[in-house]
């Protein structure tokens, strides 16, 4: 058993039929010695009396909020949560495996630039009795500070018969230099509690590997005289690291017909303009990627040819 | 993804072209190592990230763009021991910091060159003959060092009398290539920045 936070404890259980469970001794946080009674959750049934209560925790029915009282007053309480281990593996029932970029990916993270700010998100099909807490650091043996906000519900989607909920959190490395060469990864730890079930999820990455620029901005077309060609121009996204001559982007320009089956013309350039042939009913799209370190491409910015 | 090949203008900052070739070469070599050594810990997640230049050069600090010198997190250790001049500074008024920056890059390349050559000598003795260093990458390092043109004593290649441990050598190669790729990215950013300024 270990303390997750004040008055909240996690009991780690090997989960198999007829498992013996864990013996837990609860102590009432009070100078009082006599007339103390114990209850579980909001039930008034007295489980025991005295300053300590010994319980055998085997299943979820044994977890919950244990309260010690004296004469109608709450003296203290302890919330017991269960963390299941099945066949030596901690349970991952609360979050959905996103399977990208590989199996067992429960947390996904992205950064728009090298400022040390990043966003992580995760998916669940659970809608109620759900709480998350996020901690992060750079490195684990001598951790350096990363500050994360509260996790918030950021999207709801219908997937077949199920509703899927996306939660996200923003974190910021406390003293980040955009030009630094990372040698220690960022560690992100998410504690998840559903009803009385506790689980934890972790992710480890370098900011450079989770970079995904915002799409190029101010995408414009300028027709060239007496020609089917147009000059496409765009700008670096506002959120990208500066100076741009140091944090350079490379771009992919694509001409796409109305039908997805039509051949796509693609041009790669380091400049912020390109000359392409604009076909009728086609659209021109541009996306960006760090010029020197090949992490993710941005989403496309698009304009119609007409 | 291959980086777009830039053909330098005659007046272009001379080292940009070489640094782009360097990044391309080390990226290709790292990819080759990851494929060839697929049963060795050679991915970014599996290896320890060591920097052989740590405490010996300070390229990131010395080459910091002016705009980032206001960022206190970037100014941990802005002292370096190099002061000299090189041909990449051709016909440009350069600051003391820029000379420090380029000489720091030169020292990095020299250290990696020695390590890679020593390692290659060991790999050539491997009966499995599984992987060798790309001669093109070694040549590109040499070209960029010549373009930087700093006067520096030649460092003798390290020689070792004991029987090489080929497994350890291949792991060390992965560690070295990952670190050198990160440094090559920094060098490319610096050259791009200097070319624009």
């Amino acid at each position: 058993i270990w303390e997750l936070k004040k008055d909240v404890y996690v009991v780690e259980l090997d989960w198999y039929p007829d498992a013996p469970g864990e013996m837990v001794v609860l102590t009432c946080d009070t100078p009082e010695e006599d007339g103390i009674t114990w209850t579980l959750d909001q039930s008034s049934e007295v489980l025991g009396s005295g300053k300590t209560l010994t319980i055998q925790v085997k299943e979820f029915g044994d977890a919950g909020q244990y309260t010690c009282h004296k004469g109608g007053e709450v003296l203290s309480h302890s919330l017991l949560l269960l963390h299941k281990k099945e066949d030596g593996i901690w349970s991952t029932d609360i979050l959905k495996d996103q399977k990208e970029p590989k199996n067992k990916t429960f947390l996904r993270c992205e950064a728009k630039n090298y400022s040390g700010r990043f966003t992580c998100w995760w998916l669940t099909t659970i809608s109620t009795d759900l709480t998350f807490s996020v901690k992060s650091s750079r490195g684990s043996s001598d951790p350096q500070g990363v500050t994360c906000g509260a996790a918030t519900l950021s999207a709801e989607r219908v997937r077949g018969d199920n509703k899927e909920y996306e939660y996200s959190v923003e974190c910021q490395e406390d003293s980040a230099c955009p030009a630094a060469e990372e040698s220690l990864p960022i560690e992100v730890m998410v504690d998840a509690v559903h009803k009385l079930k506790y689980e934890n999820y972790t992710s480890s990455f370098f900011i450079r590997d989770i970079i995904k620029p915002d799409p190029p901005k101010n995408l414009q077309l300028k027709p060239l005289k007496n020609s089917r060609q147009v000059e496409v121009s765009w700008e670096y996204p506002d959120t990208w690291s500066t100076p741009h001559s140091y944090f350079s982007l490379t771009f992919c320009v694509q001409v796409q017909g109305k039908s997805k089956r039509e051949k796509k013309d693609r041009v790669f350039t380091d400049k912020t303009s390109a000359t392409v042939i604009c076909r009728k009913n086609a659209s021109i799209s541009v996306r960006a990627q760090d010029r020197y370190y090949s992490s993710s491409w941005s989403e496309w910015a698009s304009v119609p040819c007409s | 993804r291959n980086l777009p090949v830039a053909t330098p203008d005659p007046g272009m900052f001379p080292c940009l072209h070489h640094s782009q070739n360097l990044l391309r070469a080390v990226s290709n070599m790292l990819q080759k190592a990851r494929q060839t050594l697929e049963f060795y810990p050679c991915t970014s997640e599996e290896i320890d990230h060591e920097d052989i230049t740590k405490d010996k050069t300070s390229t990131v600090e010395a080459c910091l763009p002016l705009e980032l010198t206001k960022n206190e997190s970037c100014l941990n250790s802005r002292e370096t021991s190099f002061i000299t001049n090189g041909s990449c500074l051709a016909s440009r008024k350069t600051s003391f910091m820029m000379a420090l920056c380029l000489s720091s890059i030169y020292e990095d390349l020299k250290m990696y060159q020695v390590e890679f050559k020593t390692m290659n000598a060991k790999l050539l003795m491997d009966p499995k003959r599984q992987i060798f260093l790309d001669q093109n990458m070694l040549a590109v390092i040499d070209e960029l060092m010549q373009a930087l043109n700093f006067n520096s004593e030649t460092v003798p290649q390290k020689s070792s009398l004991e029987e090489p441990d080929f497994y350890k050598t291949k792991i060390k190669l992965c560690i070295l290539l990952h670190a050198f790729r990160i440094r090559a990215v920094t060098i490319d950013r610096v050259m791009s920045y200097l070319n624009a300024s």
Partner: nanobody, 114 residues
Framework: QVQLVESGGGLVQPGGSLRLSCAAS????????MSWYRQAPGKEHELVAG??????KYADSVKGRFTISRDNAKKTVYLQMNSLKPEDTAVYYC?????????WGQGTQVTVSS
């Protein structure tokens, strides 16, 4: 998602009364103890009152003046505040008790001033 929405705060003269309400959703309300915390400017959060398994707990500074109650059917917890003093001025938050991570509401401001 756990949601706690406080209301009922306002400006009141010393000696006056207010009743705060907290509407809860996103969790099984009847299974949890509930509490009211407050935070005065520049001070730590302090537990004002809690209700759990039918029993209550009060901070010494509010005993005899404040009363906590709950209505499980309405998923609401209340704080009746009488004989208010200037030192009761703070933002009042409701929370599950014991608190589970950051499940605060946005708070309701109570100002006691003549």
């Amino acid at each position: 998602q756990v949601q706690l929405v406080e209301s009922g705060g306002g400006l009141v003269q010393p000696g006056g009364s207010l009743r705060l309400s907290c509407a809860a959703s996103g969790f099984t309300f009847s299974s949890y103890g509930m509490s009211w915390y407050r935070q005065a400017p520049g001070k730590e959060h302090e537990l004002v009152a809690g209700i759990s398994a039918g029993s209550t707990k009060y901070a010494d500074s509010v005993k005899g003046r404040f009363t906590i109650s709950r209505d499980n059917a309405k998923k609401t917890v209340y704080l009746q505040m009488n004989s208010l003093k200037p030192e009761d001025t703070a933002v009042y938050y409701c929370s599950r008790w014991p608190r589970l991570f950051e499940d605060w509401g946005q708070g309701t401001q109570v100002t006691v001033s003549s």
